[in-house]
Interface confidence: low
């Protein structure tokens, strides 16, 4: 069978298959996985050796399964993200690995996810996968494997379906601080043109709470029309995108055009189960701008964060709507041979 026809047919068959055919569904998924991964395998076969002398950067990629099938009632995505996405951001900063939440259930808008998944576009192919965390590392060999190992150890802690573990407690404390209930000023920082000034510092501990800094000044109501972009949180200096509101979230003033991304980019403030928007990047800014006028395009919402590593560390893994680097847009990198799902380590739960 012709290769280009085979994959779409497999995917269509998987979509139309009754969910009760568990084994058939699994076999189809494996065949799709095998077929999608074949290009990557060819590349890996050519790169059999590690050059540890020149210490050139290598790219490692692992996909860690989020155990939603075992624990469908537990919101792992919320736990991974933490308040404003800070837990995942800090986890990335601490481990030096890029982490993206991908797969079925990785978009907040369920209807949009289904629509994009059915579109058959390669960049949305991951929406047919199981919900997972993609961990990517780009570093010299020894450092790369060390970072990946650290990342895998840390991510485990977030995949325990416990509502009252240490992570949860830290997140609640942080949330309490962020909402001003632990300071008299209820300070929110100053918001203007979509940028929020709020003092904070990256924690070197696990992706939990940060010790509350002194409260910033009281919040200032933004002039009408400037609430279009979300606030950004200036944590580390090399943070990435400036968010865009969801396409249907029209600006508060008709005809208002969103400000361009600031030269010094900063983290956006995602909340749990993030509600709105992807991120700007050079190539897509105009697209978003146009969407304000037409209100027809819709912005996919994935859980994906940049982190404090050098600007050229990663190619954009993702579709342009949620690219977190400013490098040119490319197709997803080929998975390494090691890039299969890692099963959830807590089988006893």
């Amino acid at each position: 069978m012709e290769e280009e026809k085979y994959l779409p047919e497999l995917m269509a068959e998987k979509d139309s298959l009754d969910p009760s055919f568990v084994h058939a569904s699994r076999l189809l998924a494996e065949e799709i996985e095998k077929f999608q991964g074949s290009d990557g395998k060819k590349e890996d076969e050519e790169k059999k050796y590690l050059d540890v002398i020149s210490n050139k950067n290598i790219k490692l990629s692992e996909r860690v399964l989020i155990p939603v099938k075992q624990y469908p009632k537990f919101n792992f995505v919320g736990k991974l993200l933490g308040p404003r996405g800070n837990s995942l951001k800090r986890l990335q900063e601490e481990t030096g690995a890029k982490m993206s939440i991908l797969g079925k259930g990785s978009m907040r808008d369920k209807a949009k996810e289904e629509e994009l998944r059915k579109s058959g576009e390669a960049k949305y192919a991951h929406l047919s996968d199981e919900l997972h965390v993609l961990i990517e590392v780009f570093a010299p060999p020894g450092e790369a494997y060390s970072r990946m190992s650290h990342a895998l150890e840390e991510i485990k802690k977030f995949l325990v379906p416990d509502y009252n573990d240490e992570i949860r407690q830290e997140q609640l404390r942080e949330l309490s601080y962020l909402n001003g209930s632990e300071d008299s000023g209820r300070g929110r920082g100053i918001r203007g043109r979509g940028i929020r000034i709020a003092p904070t510092a990256p924690s070197r501990g696990r992706g939990g709470a940060i010790p509350p800094p002194p409260p910033p000044g009281r919040g200032v109501l933004t002039p009408r029309g400037s609430t279009v972009t979300r606030g950004a949180l200036p944590v580390p200096p090399v943070a990435r995108g400036v968010p865009t509101p969801r396409a249907r979230g029209a600006p508060t003033v008709p005809g208002y055009r969103a400000p361009p991304p600031p030269a010094h980019e900063a983290y956006e403030e995602y909340g749990y189960d993030d509600g709105y928007g992807g991120e700007y990047d050079d190539q897509t800014y105009e697209t978003y701008d146009n969407s304000y006028a037409t209100q027809t395009q819709s912005v996919p919402e994935y859980y994906d964060y940049g982190h404090g590593v050098s600007e050229d560390a990663y190619d954009s893994y993702a579709p342009e709507e949620w690219a977190t680097t400013r490098s040119s847009l490319k197709a997803p990198p080929q998975r390494s041979a090691r890039g299969g799902y890692r099963e959830h380590p807590y089988g006893r739960y």
Partner: antibody
Framework: PVHLVQSGAEVKKPGSSVKVSCKLS????????IIWVRQAPGQGLEWMGT????????NYAEKFQDRVAIVADEATSTVYMEVNSLRSEDTAIYFC??????????????????????WGQGTLVTVSS | DIVMTQSPDSLAVSLGERATINCKSS????????????LAWYQHKPGQPPKLLIY???TRESGVPDRFSGSGSGTDFTLTINSLQAEDVAVYYC??????????FGGGTKVEIK
């Protein structure tokens, strides 16, 4: 106790604007979606728009996009909705409501509009010449 | 947009009898990753704000009497009031939150005493 308190009734002329406020007392403000819903005489509930204060972004129902603005003042835990170019069919009770804290996305807070546990008392806006 | 259609528009039920209200969505509101139905029910009395009764299609809100129950999945949902009381006279609305822009409500069902 947590309350949403809305501003008082308004009588407006066609073509003018109205700004209704909705103040949260005693609860978390920034992280929950606040929606505006209206009920015209003899009609059902109609969603107008949503804001999540921490994001500062608003979503609007298509029919209101050109003439409704929803903004949030985090300092005072207040959301404002302004409706421009009023017409007689805008005569309605306008309600604000805040997303629920109960079992929110299975124990973790979600910054998205879902179901609404806390409602303001409603603001009657009458548009008449 | 997801269109929510309620039936009947109104119904009159004797005190102590059962009232059944149906709600149909134009597309599924069941999300496969968590097997949850993104649907809520509200009670709305004149001069008052709506009151949340049920969320996730079948979870009763705290403080809501157990005579109110929600059922259904996918696109077809039912609110049942067992043993109707005088204070249950109101308009009942279903609301989907599977797609949050726009959030959509059903047209409402008026429940009266026969």
């Amino acid at each position: 106790p947590v309350h949403l308190v809305q501003s008082g009734a308004e009588v407006k002329k066609p073509g003018s604007s109205v700004k209704v406020s909705c103040k949260l007392s005693g609860g978390i403000f920034s992280y929950f979606a606040i929606i505006w819903v209206r009920q015209a005489p003899g009609q059902g509930l109609e969603w107008m728009g949503t804001i999540i204060p921490i994001f500062g972004t608003s979503n609007y129902a298509e029919k209101f996009q050109d003439r409704v603005a929803i903004v949030a003042d985090e300092a005072t835990s207040t959301v404002y909705m302004e409706v421009n170019s009023l017409r007689s069919e805008d005569t309605a009770i306008y309600f604000c409501a805040r997303d629920s804290e109960v079992e929110k996305s299975d124990g973790y807070m979600a910054s998205t509009a879902e179901y609404f546990q806390l409602w303001g008392q409603g603001t009657l806006v009458t548009v008449s010449s | 947009d997801i269109v929510m259609t309620q039936s009947p528009d109104s119904l009159a039920v004797s005190l102590g009898e059962r009232a059944t209200i149906n709600c149909k969505s134009s597309q599924t509101v069941l999300h496969s990753s968590n097997n949850r139905n993104y649907l809520a029910w509200y009670q709305h009395k004149p001069g008052q704000p709506p009151k949340l009764l049920i969320y996730w299609a079948s979870t009763r809100e705290s403080g809501v009497p157990d005579r109110f129950s929600g059922s259904g999945s996918g696109t077809d949902f039912t609110l049942t009031i067992n043993s109707l009381q005088a204070e249950d006279v109101a308009v009942y609305y279903c609301q989907q939150y599977y797609d949050t822009a726009p959030l959509t409500f059903g047209g409402g069902t008026k429940v009266e005493i026969k």
